[in-house]
Interface confidence: medium
Amino acid sequence: SSPTSSASSFSSSAPFLASAVSAQPPLPDQCPALCECSEAARTVKCVNRNLTEVPTDLPAYVRNLFLTGNQLAVLPAGAFARRPPLAELAALNLSGSRLDEVRAGAFEHLPSLRQLDLSHNPLADLSPFAFSGSNASVSAPSPLVELILNHIVPPEDERQNRSFEGMVVAALLAGRALQGLRRLELASNHFLYLPRDVLAQLPSLRHLDLSNNSLVSLTYVSFRNLTHLESLHLEDNALKVLHNGTLAELQGLPHIRVFLDNNPWVCDCHMADMVTWLKETEVVQGKDRLTCAYPEKMRNRVLLELNSADLDCDPILPPSLQTS
């Protein structure tokens, strides 16, 4: 009755369903209402449709699933579990779908899931077992290779009475399920600190994005185990200085590229080691753009142009000489 469109490989119809009378058997792979499907591209898009739950009738061929711009609110356990399973689903994008809760086992029964994007969801409640699926001390390895968690911090009034950083890290470390993770993006999450154990337990990381957070210091963070790390994004944080231990660890990583732009570097005597290192290292991208923010007299000075005479600290006055 309705001929199919040849305008695009994305279709909400299929040629063998064009006629009103069809001798075909029941079709397990129909496109869900409110979605667009391309069997050729193995892709289903249910984008900006105000869906309140994951469609139950996803086609078994789906390899790339976009569920962005919806109103899902909660991802329950087994949200993508189907019989037969979605065995080929490799890339799942749930960004901007107003998720505030991801429950334990939400991504179970997705044996091929390599890329997961939960960005731009206010995740007030991310279960520690969201990615591992079980509360066992050692879970079955997750197939995830890329985990994108940019801007998942909920508004302050919606946060639980616990550390947001701690909640996220608990989910990353549970059951050591994410040992194979190669890309982790945690940008724009208001992180004040990075729990010290998190990187040690993600040994396969190639790319780590911590940009646009509120990290003040990396003193207690160890990069030593991340021998495969290729890019470390620390732009737009609140870093004041990198100390010797951190500098040595970064220098020891064979493939690393570090991005440090737009941090409020404090150019006093504590900065001397970092300046020396910057002049020698090749690992910092755009190092000539790094400038001082404090003290006032040093503002906008380029770090690479400083020498030891520039980097002084005000003497600490004895209490009797201090003014209020």
């Epitope: 009378v21 397990p28 667009e36």
Partner: antibody, heavy 120, light 111 residues
């Protein structure tokens, strides 16, 4: 020839129940999503409910959510609408309609409709 | 919910003359690939009949004097030369999200 024939309408008191049926023929019923749409006397069209081909997905208009249930029996080529807690504002002609396989094609076949009157 | 606003409310047309009906959605009902907007004709005492699907595609068996156009939020149904049998009410409808909603209808009469 594609045919959709509704039945089950009638006069019913507020708060009571009614079950509408839609018998389909002339196409492979189990391949198609189905809808109910209603039209109050002298008014426009109002979409009521949708069910996917394999009965795994249901959607309802807010005005009927929790009171109406859409279902289908693919072995009998029949679509149903169970209407509970009926109200005067549910008075309308109820049409069943077919989504041609993939829903972006609109509703390509409609039945003649069955009239439901809710009155005390 | 997406609100569909149809204009005009009614239309009186001389046979052989063109007619145009507009439908505006309160938000976009088009993706980069498709427009999820459809047009129906309802003759007196009959069920609606699909005329145009996906904004501009003529349903099988519908005379080619009917045409549809538009994307995003603004859509138009045109009848190039109105005939006596075209009297009835014309509705636009989106299938972008739940709930699907219809326009209020445009009544077409013959002068």
């Amino acid at each position: 020839e594609v045919q959709l024939v509704e039945s089950g309408g009638g006069v019913v008191q507020p708060g009571r129940s009614l079950r509408l049926s839609c018998a389909a023929s002339g196409f492979t019923f189990s391949n198609f999503g189905m809808h109910w749409v209603r039209q109050a006397p002298g008014k426009g069209l109002e979409w009521v409910a949708y069910i996917s081909s394999g009965s795994s997905t249901f959607y309802y208009a807010d005005s009927v959510k929790g009171r109406f249930t859409i279902s289908r029996d693919n072995s009998k080529n029949t679509l149903y609408l169970q209407m509970n807690s009926l109200r005067a504002e549910d008075t309308a002609v109820y049409y069943c309609a077919r989504s041609p396989a993939y829903y972006r094609y609109g509703l390509d076949y409609w039945g003649q409709g069955t009239t439901v009157t809710v009155s005390s | 919910d997406i609100v569909m606003t149809q204009t005009p409310l009614s239309l009186s047309v001389t046979p052989g003359q063109p007619a145009s009906i507009s439908c505006r959605a309160s938000q976009s009902v088009s993706s980069s690939t498709f427009s999820y907007m459809h047009w129906y004709q309802q003759k007196p005492g009959q069920p609606p009949q699909l005329l145009i699907y996906s904004s501009s595609n003529l349903e099988s068996g519908v005379p080619d004097r009917f045409s549809g156009s538009g994307s995003g939020t603004d859509f138009t149904l045109k009848i190039s030369r109105v005939e006596a049998e075209d009297v009835g009410v014309y509705y636009c409808q989106h299938s972008w999200e739940i709930p699907y909603t219809f326009g209020g209808g445009t009544k077409v009469e013959i002068k």
